[in-house]
């Protein structure tokens, strides 16, 4: 059993190395942005929305694009729970310094949490997505 | 109604300490990163410090590192900077700001000058 | 460290003329979720900082129209379409993908 476990863990390295995360991040990040542009999460600002809407953002065709390829890497760990879950923690792990906000977070992991399902994959069951507030810088 | 209230400014000798204080009401102070910003008439504009949300994570500039501390009392929505060891350079008006969220700084106290002069 | 440069250092206007302002970074500010970590900002006279544009190309809230941010990788450029008296002060570049770096600024002055 030991050695299956490593061959596993061995196996999920190499697909995770192989992966390329990067679709899924900028998906995740342009719907939390788009999210906050329409609804303004900041209840505190003077106009209920910190920032104004970016036809970038709204026009959603890049991140659908996103969407898609993020849902093909995504698909090499559907027999792999486990491995589903280090590449959610990764994804978390990457963005984490780039959200500086308790809510922004927040909605973050929820978004990333719901990915596997948005792409018609099984999500993890569990999965521990908590990293240190507001993110280390990493460049 | 936003407010972000800079005080602890005053004039200092080369070497000796400071305290400034930034008392946030109106905002959602324990939710978002928090900064110093300094601004003095030969650099413009300086990032100083930052704070995560929770308090874990400080970051610095280099000009600063060792001799400034950034902290943060959540139960009295205060963020503070502890500036030891200051320098002649250190003289500007620092102000806080607060985060966006998405590491823009969104917004800005009025700021108060500290002068290191001996 | 990176290092923002900007140009002119000081830019006399003309109002209802448009202006522009260019930042240069020493490195790359696209983050890996293809964003580029830059925003500008600026300061009038007497008054504090105010957010312009984020994120290079956004238009922070309650700010006119008339000011548009474009530029990817590692140079970048503020516009004023038709400049107003008001708009008068120092504009300063920051990139935020490693820590926070402000450029130098360029004073903006009526002619």
């Known amino acids: 059993r030991q050695q299956w476990e490593l061959q596993g863990d061995r196996r999920c390295q190499s697909q995770l190395e192989r992966a390329n995360l990067r679709p899924c991040e900028q998906h995740l990040m342009q719907k939390i942005q788009r999210d906050e542009d329409s609804y303004g999460r900041d209840p505190y600002s003077p106009s209920q929305d910190p920032y104004s809407p970016s036809p970038y953002d709204r026009r959603g065709a890049g991140s659908s694009q996103h969407q898609e390829r993020c849902c093909n890497e995504l698909n090499e760990f559907e027999n792999n729970q486990r491995c589903m879950c280090e590449a959610l923690q990764q994804i978390m792990e990457n963005q984490s310094d780039r959200l500086q906000g308790r809510q922004q977070e927040q909605q973050f992991k929820r978004e990333l949490r719901n990915l596997p399902q948005q792409c018609g994959l099984r999500a993890p069951q569990r999965c521990d997505l908590e990293v240190e507030s507001g993110g280390r810088d990493r460049y | 109604q936003v407010q972000l209230v800079e005080s602890g400014g005053g004039v200092v000798q080369p070497g000796r300490s400071l305290r400034l204080s930034c008392a946030a009401s109106?905002?959602?102070?324990?939710?978002?990163?928090m900064h110093w910003v300094r601004r003095s008439p030969d650099k413009g504009l300086e990032w100083v410090a930052a704070?995560?949300?929770?308090?874990?994570?400080?970051y610095y500039a280099d000009s600063v590192k060792g001799r400034f501390t950034i902290s943060r009392d959540s139960s009295k929505n205060t963020l503070f900077l502890q500036m030891d060891s200051l320098r002649v350079e250190d003289t500007a008006v620092y102000y806080c700001?607060?985060?966006?969220?998405?590491?823009?700084?969104?917004?800005w106290g009025q700021g108060t000058l500290v002068t290191v002069s001996s | 460290e990176i290092v923002l440069t900007q140009s002119p250092l000081s830019l006399p206007v003309t109002p209802g003329e448009p202006a522009s302002i260019s930042c240069r970074s020493s490195?790359?500010?696209?983050?890996?979720?293809?964003?580029?970590?830059l925003d500008w900002y600026l300061q009038k006279p007497g008054q504090s900082p105010q957010l312009l544009i984020y994120?290079?190309?956004k238009r922070a809230s309650g700010v006119p129209d008339r000011f548009s941010g474009s530029g990817s990788g590692t140079d970048f450029t503020l516009k004023i379409s038709r400049v107003e008296a008001e708009d008068v002060g120092v504009y300063y570049c920051?990139?935020?993908?490693?820590?926070?770096?402000f450029g130098q600024g360029t004073k903006v002055e009526i002619k």
């Open positions: 704070i995560s949300y929770g308090g874990t994570n400080k």
């Open positions: 920051m990139q935020a993908l490693q820590t926070w770096t």
């Open positions: 994120m290079a190309s």
């Open positions: 700001a607060r985060d966006s969220g998405y590491r823009s700084l969104l917004h």
């Open positions: 490195q790359s500010l696209v983050h890996r979720n293809g964003y580029n970590y």
């Open positions: 109106g905002i959602a102070f324990n939710d978002y990163t």
